[in-house]
Amino acid sequence: WELTILHTNDVHSRLEQTSEDSSKCVNASRCMGGVARLFTKVQQIRRAEPNVLLLDAGDQYQGTIWFTVYKGAEVAHFMNALRYDAMALGNHEFDNGVEGLIEPLLKEAKFPILSANIKAKGPLASQISGLYLPYKVLPVGDEVVGIVGYTSKETPFLSNPGTNLVFEDEITALQPEVDKLKTLNVNKIIALGHSGFEMDKLIAQKVRGVDVVVGGHSNTFLYTGNPPSKEVPAGKYPFIVTSDDGRKVPVVQAYAFGKYLGYLKIEFDERGNVISSHGNPILLNSSIPEDPSIKADINKWRIKLDNYSTQELGKTIVYLDGSSQSCRFRECNMGNLICDAMINNNLRHTDEMFWNHVSMCILNGGGIRSPIDERNNGTITWENLAAVLPFGGTFDLVQLKGSTLKKAFEHSVHRYGQSTGEFLQVGGIHVVYDLSRKPGDRVVKLDVLCTKCRVPSYDPLKMDEVYKVILPNFLANGGDGFQMIKDELLRHDSGDQDINVVSTYISKMKVIYPAVEGRIKFS
């Protein structure tokens, strides 16, 4: 019996087609992805093959103005239109709190939404009961397939799930659910979830009875043969893991942002054992037509976005200096504003010992592309912020050793004075440079804000200590020459859309007046 699994993950609000790098589509003839194009390909495959499941491994939420405006309603609407069969909850599905998941998505989705390792407690337990499930048995042709969901247990540090959801260890939570499916005579089981490729592989290895793992969170690109675009494969598609009980378990993921549609064909024997598996992600490039009816619907929903872009988010009573003459040479108040917003967006008081789990922010000055003049009645709009942060990036959470941070700050000024983008703006950090010293030895003081303290204060950076830092995904990926971050990071979790972080902060503060306050000094 053959099953075709079509899968997406980490779509992050890319409802419209995007450029090859998943930013805003500029030249339509070279654009990719989007739900209208995805629908075309899904429909083609459904037409051609008998047993097809369309699955999403989480993180539909967060990433473009679509999510900012529609807050998840767009996800439910278009996933319903594409007739998804199941979705796993990702960490970003909790970005607007549990209510922001329940109302727009859980109550509106016409497909099951899954996670076996999230347990509700207190008053939430009855409110959310039945709205998401640990597993679902789906009829496919003449057979049944069990789908069991899982979500990163780091979600409380990455999003806003509140205090009434407990995120258990994935493997511990999955095993009894899979066992339950086996007792129900379901012998074909897919683990669908959002914990990253390493955990996907562990699930394939450790959870008895799981036949296939469809994952997300780590934006992993797997491919067999010559890859069709810029993404470099982390391994073959599917990635085969030998389970502890000796089975070959295919593990798949389909990069991110709706750029690819994962396509996996599995052949099962009559006892539900995987005989063979093959496939590849399908690049959704512009040669695949956008479905006209879905496209028309997208255009209808778009109207509200255009209106939103020009509405006031808040006010500034000071000039927001985002000029390259400032931000690439010294502390600039636009850099301070953005870093403060980044930290504010990551306030998660999850432990009595810590006032917060993260206190530090770094931001490449070259990523700040425009100032905002306060003389326009102080008004700040989304459109203004899009000029400051035009690249459609995310502000991510990483874990780095102090020694890596020191290298990053040396890199920040290694060729100071040439208006290059690597000069770092900061938050929760006090740095002093001596430019008279040779490159690589210019950081004379580097103090960081404590987290394990009731009264935050600045202490010298410790080389062997592991620190959490919020930074642009561009830096996490080694951009602007920050190879040491990419090479030495110990953990990387993708965060919220950059503009969304700053806009939320401005809306929350209502009136802002960031200052230049001595975060960066020269001796």
């Epitope: 075309t40 495959i45 051609a48 093959e49 512009s286 037509p289």
Partner: antibody, heavy 121, light 107 residues
């Protein structure tokens, strides 16, 4: 090398049955769709229907539904077009054409050389 | 069924000429349009797929454009081997329909 090899020309009488074939080689037969296209003498192209040999799913142009049957034998990588009762108006050239539904070339990328069917009393 | 109206039905041109053939769909077909070349006694050959993508091995003088309902095939510098009949086809919805064809003849 991808090839679609069609069976030879046929001359038939009205009311007779006929089954013409199209054998695919040089590619995975079950991973592509196969269509049949009719071209009457001096006329244009008409899509008759298609089969996906991997699943056996068939789709017909309403105009030809009930008039012809499309089938495939994946064990020998061959698709068929058959008539149970031919009419003089079935006289035409019949082409099979391949369709890559997993790829992005929206069109028929390979065609057979065609099978001439002549129906005459 | 979606109708594909092709024009002109025939056209006389000389080698070196620039020739444009148009095709109009009766409803929005996005970019799901292909163009074929057929010579007498031969099977059609795919030239352009998805409205504007040149199929492998097709000379660069052939180009396609359009989306929605209006499509064009352009031959920038006509060669002697280009005299043939050209068909557009929509691949958006079944029944997949072809235009009536444009016969390109030597002037």
């Amino acid at each position: 090398e991808v090839q679609l090899v069609q069976s030879g020309a046929e001359v038939k009488k009205p009311g007779e049955s006929l089954k013409i074939s199209c054998k695919g080689s040089g590619y995975t037969f079950t991973s592509y769709g196969l269509s049949w296209v009719r071209q009457m003498p001096g006329k244009g192209l008409e899509w008759m229907g298609e089969i996906y040999p991997g699943s056996g799913n068939t789709y017909y142009n309403e105009k030809f539904k009930g008039q012809v049957t499309i089938s495939a034998d994946k064990s020998i990588s061959t698709a068929y077009l058959q008539w149970s009762s031919l009419k003089a108006s079935d006289t035409a050239m019949y082409y099979c054409a391949r369709y890559d539904y997993l790829g992005s070339s929206y069109g028929f990328d390979y065609w057979g050389a065609g099978t001439t069917v002549t129906v005459s009393s | 069924a979606i109708r594909m109206t092709q024009s002109p039905s025939s056209f006389s041109a000389s080698t070196g000429d620039r020739v444009t053939i148009t095709c109009k769909a009766s409803q929005d077909v996005s970019t799901a349009v292909a163009w074929y070349q057929q010579k007498p006694g031969k099977a059609p050959k795919l030239l352009i797929y998805s409205a504007s993508y040149r199929y492998s091995g097709v000379p660069s003088r052939f180009s396609g454009s359009g989306s929605g309902t209006d499509f064009t095939l352009t031959i920038s510098c006509l060669q002697s081997e280009d005299f043939a009949t050209y068909y557009c086809q929509q691949h958006y919805n079944t029944p997949y329909t072809f235009g009536g064809g444009t016969k390109l003849e030597i002037k």
